[in-house]
């Protein structure tokens, strides 16, 4: 007898994991055998779709590999033409083990700023997210919070927040761990110990001390009166993210010394500065009788001529004595290019010692003139011919007025080493005695006006003169 369809096994809710099998059963009793159709969210399932399997005349519908998108309401409808069609529905809930879709990444952050480590997850049931720092679960506090999204937010990042982090996503089906990431906390450069100001006597040695910290460890540079320090020695050491820099100075003039600590944060730099003043006891601005100060020679032209670290007199009648006197020497040396090979080294020695006179430090720095004997040795022995030309140019006013120092020294006005050996400066480069000089042919027709002294011997001779050179 014909019998209208009756669903004997109504559909139930099916839970399935992604990639698993899910089966709905819709057992039907009827005669004749019914046509069974299936829908998902009221859309007909095509039975030739290879993602599905149909068994037992449509009474079993199997999804062979569940996807996220399969979630929904499934209904089976049975109809055999006898009575009305019957329907039963059930839900497919696609369950999913936790999956971290946006894992955290390594972060570099400056102390005091806000850091956010992402951890976006998927899963059904919705996973709960927690974080591990190092090997221990991370505790939330007023600064540290796990957001609804799973991301970790750290307000006012501190140095101690640095370390290795990973997020953990958990639901009833399993647990997923992110890879371990590094939170690096960078700290602006900061000076821990500033250099101290000193009031010292002229010619003292002073050590300025500057200590700085930061992450990364900063570098320290020293500035003297606005320029990079050119003299003095710097010693540095680094320990536990602290850099210690010591600048040792030989004090010949007052100055402002600045310690600058710098470190880099990405493309930007942070700096910290601290300054110290060096003043010289009883130092005052040059008076009428105090026309300059002593300082180490820092130029280039006279480097080979003047003794290393020589204290020279800098004339404060110039705005910038060092630069002005260097320019004078430079200009004069260019004039010397045309003189004879015998004259030139002697003239250079005389010129450098005349323009950059040796300096006697003290309450009133005093220039020490060249000894007359050395001046005469250059004038009448080595450079007789050239000297005449230079004197003539000076008298005819061929040198500009500001070049008055270029006027060759008047040897007769210079102190003699016989009067007071400490009152004048010697030219160590002229290491010739009378015996050497006698081998030279006569330099002029006139007799030297004074007896050429025995010049002191020096091991640092910067030139030698062969007797075969002609002076004419």
């Amino acid at each position: 007898l014909p019998k209208a369809p009756v669903i004997t096994t109504p559909l139930e809710t099916v839970d399935a994991l992604v990639e698993e099998v899910a089966t709905f059963m819709c057992a039907v009793e009827s005669y004749p055998q019914p046509e069974i159709s299936w829908t998902r969210n009221k859309i007909l399932i095509k039975l030739f779709d290879t993602r599905y399997s149909i068994r037992e005349n449509g009474q079993l519908l199997t999804i062979l590999s569940v996807e996220d998108s399969d979630d929904g309401i499934y209904c089976c409808t049975a109809n055999n033409g006898v009575g009305g069609a019957v329907e039963s529905c059930g839900a497919l809930q696609v369950k999913m083990k936790p999956k971290i879709t946006r894992p955290p990444i390594n972060v570099k952050i400056i102390e005091g700023l806000k850091a956010v480590l992402p951890c976006t997850t998927m899963g059904n049931p919705k996973p709960s997210v927690s974080w591990i720092k190092g090997d221990s679960p991370l505790r939330e506090n007023s600064r540290i919070a796990v957001l609804e999204s799973g991301s970790l937010r750290i307000h006012n990042v501190q140095k101690e927040d640095a370390g290795q982090y990973r997020c953990v996503a958990k639901n009833s089906l399993g647990t997923a761990y992110s890879k371990v990431v590094k939170l690096e906390v960078e700290v602006f450069a900061r000076i821990l110990r500033a250099p101290e100001s000193h009031n010292v006597t002229f010619g003292s040695f002073v050590t300025l001390h500057c200590t700085a910290t930061g992450i990364p460890v900063p570098t320290i540079t020293w500035i003297e009166n606005g320029n990079a320090v050119s003299s003095g020695s710097i010693q540095e050491s680094v320990k536990d993210r602290v850099i210690d820099s010591r600048l040792q100075l030989f004090i010949t003039k007052p100055g402002l010394y600045t310690c600058i600590a710098t470190n880099k944060h990405g493309e930007k730099f942070s700096t910290a500065k601290a300054a110290a003043t060096i003043s010289i006891a009883e130092w005052s601005k040059p008076q009428k009788d105090n026309k300059g100060y002593c300082a180490q020679y820092r130029g280039e032209v006279c480097n080979a001529v003047l003794a290393k670290d020589a204290l020279v007199f800098l004339n404060t009648s110039y705005a910038d004595p060092e630069e002005a006197q260097e320019l004078l020497v430079h200009t004069a040396w260019n004039e010397l290019k045309v003189v004879s090979p015998v004259c030139r080294p002697a003239a250079e020695a005389l010129l450098c010692n005349h323009i950059f006179q040796e300096c006697s430090p003290g309450v009133v720095p005093t220039p020490i003139p060249i000894c007359r004997e050395y001046c005469l040795a250059v004038k009448e022995l080595f450079c007789a011919k050239e000297w005449l030309v230079m004197e003539e140019k000076t008298h005819r006013g061929l040198y500009r007025s500001e070049m008055h120092l270029l006027s060759v020294p008047e040897c007769s006005k210079l102190p003699s080493m016989h009067w007071d050996p400490t009152a004048c400066a010697r030219l160590p480069h002229l290491d010739y005695n009378k015996e050497n000089l006698k081998t030279f042919p006569p330099m002029t027709s006139s007799k030297p006006s004074v007896d050429i002294p025995n010049l002191p011997s020096s091991s640092s001779s910067s030139f030698s003169v062969s007797p075969t050179y002609s002076m004419t």
Partner: antibody, heavy 121, light 107 residues
């Protein structure tokens, strides 16, 4: 009474072919899904293949796909298994079974006595 | 494929003992599990279907339970004719799979 009788087993060389048959009686064959299940000597049961009553739905065990073919002739109430490229590991007793929709899922409620297939050189 | 893992693989027991065999599925399969008994040289016989329903003609000492992934076959009081090999089978997927079997022997 449901009856299933297998035939066609025997000795075959590796690489050879064999066709098994199953004669069914005592039930509406054309309305029933039929299956082959095998059992290697001293081993467990292994489902091989199933075919729906109208032959529209056919399934094979993944490991056998491409070498075995299930078919049926409802007019003759017969089920067949064509086995090609036979290997030593195909040596087993092959059972013909009727699949039946149960309260949940399907089960094999009737079995034949089995036919032995030996693949050996 | 859905794997069915049966334990133990063999079991020695005496007549009158209560025996339990378990079967675990590799994914949730609702109650789509059947149990079979096979004696040496014979074809398997359906004992229990839909995880817990006794096939007609099967003695009531046999019972089945479980849902999801874990299933159990229990023989409340072993009889001499119960010494055989038992198999679980899933039909949740159309690619049917059996457990590897549990051989029940007389102690």
């Amino acid at each position: 009474e449901v009856q299933l009788v297998e035939s066609g087993g025997g000795l075959v060389k590796p690489g050879g072919s064999l066709r098994l048959s199953c004669a069914a009686s005592g039930f509406t064959f054309s309305a029933s899904t039929m299956a082959w299940v095998r059992q290697a000597p001293g081993k467990g049961l292994e489902w091989v293949s199933s075919v729906s009553g109208d032959s529209h739905h056919i399934y094979y065990a993944d490991s056998l796909k491409g070498r075995f073919t299930i078919s049926r002739d409802n007019a003759k109430n017969s089920l067949y298994l064509q086995m090609n490229s036979l290997r030593a590991e195909d040596t087993a007793v092959y059972y013909c079974a009727r699949e039946r929709l149960l309260r949940l899922g399907v089960g094999f409620d009737s079995w034949g006595q089995g036919t032995l297939v030996t693949v050996s050189s | 494929d859905i794997q069915m893992t049966q334990s133990p693989s063999s079991l020695s027991a005496s007549v009158g003992d209560r025996v339990t065999i378990t079967c675990r599925a590799s994914q949730r399969i609702s109650g789509f599990v059947n149990w079979y008994q096979q004696k040496p040289g014979k074809a398997p016989k359906l004992l229990i279907y839909a995880a817990s329903t006794l096939q007609s003609g099967v003695p009531s000492r046999f019972s089945g339970s479980g849902s999801g992934t874990d299933f159990t076959l229990t023989i409340s009081s072993l009889q001499p004719e119960d010494f055989a090999t038992y198999y679980c089978q899933q039909s949740y997927s159309p690619l049917y799979t059996f457990g590897q079997g549990t051989k029940l022997e007389i102690k």
